[in-house]
Interface confidence: low
């Protein structure tokens, strides 16, 4: 998505099928207020952005309300009347789901079921990563609803958990973004803990899609 024209790099993120953020990095125009013009239909007139993002006092992006839009975004980034980057993109291919909400843990002996509120659209994977202080890497399990059961845990160990949502690649394509992680929560013997005291600094979680 970052293809350059006149040295302009762009990034598109479609937050939770609600808001589209288009940002640009144009070294040639670093001290210029570029304008962003867009339309959702190929045969409509362009509208100008009304909600710019600023970096060091200059425009660097645009936020658009686009709730569950069924569309291609046609856009043009301009220096005055001169287009410096023009493109069209299926917005949904740049989906970033929202972070899991209402995450709950239900313990039964050596297993835990992690649940959260499913998002209002489909073809998502809900991924739970977990580790104890004795694990060198995060373990991972995912399901296509937010109801993930992890078995074979050691009741005596303290485990850290967090959850995120990913778009299925065979539906949305390869250019989506995983959601932000939920907050880390720590559990031992079925009870929540402030932290897993003996936990060394956790390694970065695997960020593969």
């Amino acid at each position: 998505q970052g293809g350059a024209a006149e040295g302009v790099q762009i990034q598109i993120i479609y937050f939770n099928l609600e808001t589209v953020q288009v940002t640009w990095n144009a070294s040639k125009y670093s001290r210029t207020n570029l304008t962003f013009h867009y339309r959702f239909n190929g045969d409509e007139a362009y509208d100008q952005c009304t909600n710019y993002l600023l970096q060091e006092g200059h425009t660097s992006g645009c936020l658009l309300d686009a709730e569950q839009r069924d569309d291609i975004l046609y856009f043009s980034i301009r220096n005055g009347t001169h287009p410096v980057f023009t493109a069209s993109r299926w917005m949904v291919y740049y989906l970033k789901p929202s972070s899991p909400k209402h995450v709950r843990f239900s313990w039964h002996q050596d297993a835990v079921t992690v649940t959260c509120s499913d998002l209002s659209y489909g073809d998502l994977l809900y991924e739970v990563q977990y580790r104890s202080p004795f694990d060198t890497e995060w373990q991972s399990k995912q399901e296509n609803t937010c109801n993930v059961t992890i078995e074979g845990l050691d009741a005596e160990k303290c485990y850290s958990f967090w959850v995120r949502v990913k778009a299925m690649e065979d539906v949305y394509g390869p250019d989506t973004y995983p959601s932000d992680w939920s907050e880390v929560t720590c559990w031992q013997r079925g009870e929540i803990r402030d932290a897993c005291a003996e936990t060394p600094t956790p390694p970065k979680p695997k960020l593969s899609k």
Epitope: L17, E67, Q68, R69, D70, D71, V92, L95, S120, Y121, G122, D123, M168, D170, V171, Y172
Partner: antibody
Framework: QVQLQQSGPEVVRPGVSVKISCKGS????????IHWVRQSHAKSLEWIGI????????NCDQKFKDKATMTVDKSSSTAYLDLARLTSEDSAIYYC????????????WGQGTLVTVSA | DIVMTQSQKFMSTSVGDRVSVTCKAS??????IAWYQQKPGQSPEALIY???YRYSGVPDRFTGSGSGTDFTLTITNVQSEDLAEYFC?????????FGGGTKLEIK
């Protein structure tokens, strides 16, 4: 141009099953989702469910889960709706329609298949 | 399930008039609403998506508005070919649901 061509009318006895088809043309079949909707005098338009030809994923209204089975044949760009254990209440026009792969509105519709359940 | 209510089953209007078809959702659906027109003996046709955006080829006398729970399809300068039934539909959450329809009669 985009077309969804459905199979012809069916007259069936109560208790049997029927399979109706919807052939897509003029677009890349796996880039979209196919929906099934039925229309009867009693119930107006009812959404049955969605299937994504790219991976066969389906989502069906719970009230149709024992009645309707959606499948696709990617090689022929055709979606199928299998209706089981038909009763007179299933007599209706069944439409296929197309949306973006993740959802959105139903931009294109087939011509409909009339299913009549009669003893 | 989200219930879509079109309280008027029939509306009568004259050529050249303006008419508004309303639709109410039982819970907030944002702007995830479409409107369809179904002429007698034909399949439904999409008019409006995302509450207010016309499909290409749809005459600009058709206008959609609203968000949340209350939506309106307005037809200005009604033409005889607008004789049809109009349905709203939500696609905020599964199962997708339709309103019961409003039949527009031309006097």
């Amino acid at each position: 141009q985009v077309q969804l061509q459905q199979s012809g009318p069916e007259v069936v006895r109560p208790g049997v099953s029927v399979k109706i088809s919807c052939k897509g043309s003029g677009f890349t079949f796996t880039d979209y989702a196919i929906h099934w909707v039925r229309q009867s005098h009693a119930k107006s338009l009812e959404w049955i469910g969605i299937i994504r030809p790219s991976n066969g994923n389906t989502n069906c209204d719970q009230k149709f889960k024992d009645k309707a089975t959606m499948t696709v044949d990617k090689s022929s760009s055709t979606a199928y709706l299998d209706l089981a254990r038909l009763t007179s209440e299933d007599s209706a026009i069944y439409y296929c329609s197309r949306s973006r792969v993740w959802g959105g509105s139903l931009a294109y519709w087939g011509q409909g298949t009339l299913v009549t359940v009669s003893a | 399930d989200i219930v879509m209510t079109q309280s008027q089953k029939f509306m009568s209007t004259s050529v050249g008039d303006r008419v508004s078809v309303t639709c109410k959702a039982s819970q907030n659906v944002g702007t995830n609403i479409a409107w369809y027109q179904q002429k007698p003996g034909q399949s439904p046709e999409a008019l409006i998506y995302s509450a207010s955006y016309r499909y290409s080829g749809v005459p600009d006398r058709f206008t959609g508005s609203g968000s949340g729970t209350d939506f309106t399809l307005t037809i200005t300068n009604v033409q005889s070919e607008d004789l049809a039934e109009y349905f709203c539909q939500q696609y905020k959450s599964y199962p997708w649901t339709f309103g019961g329809g409003t039949k527009l009669e031309i006097k």
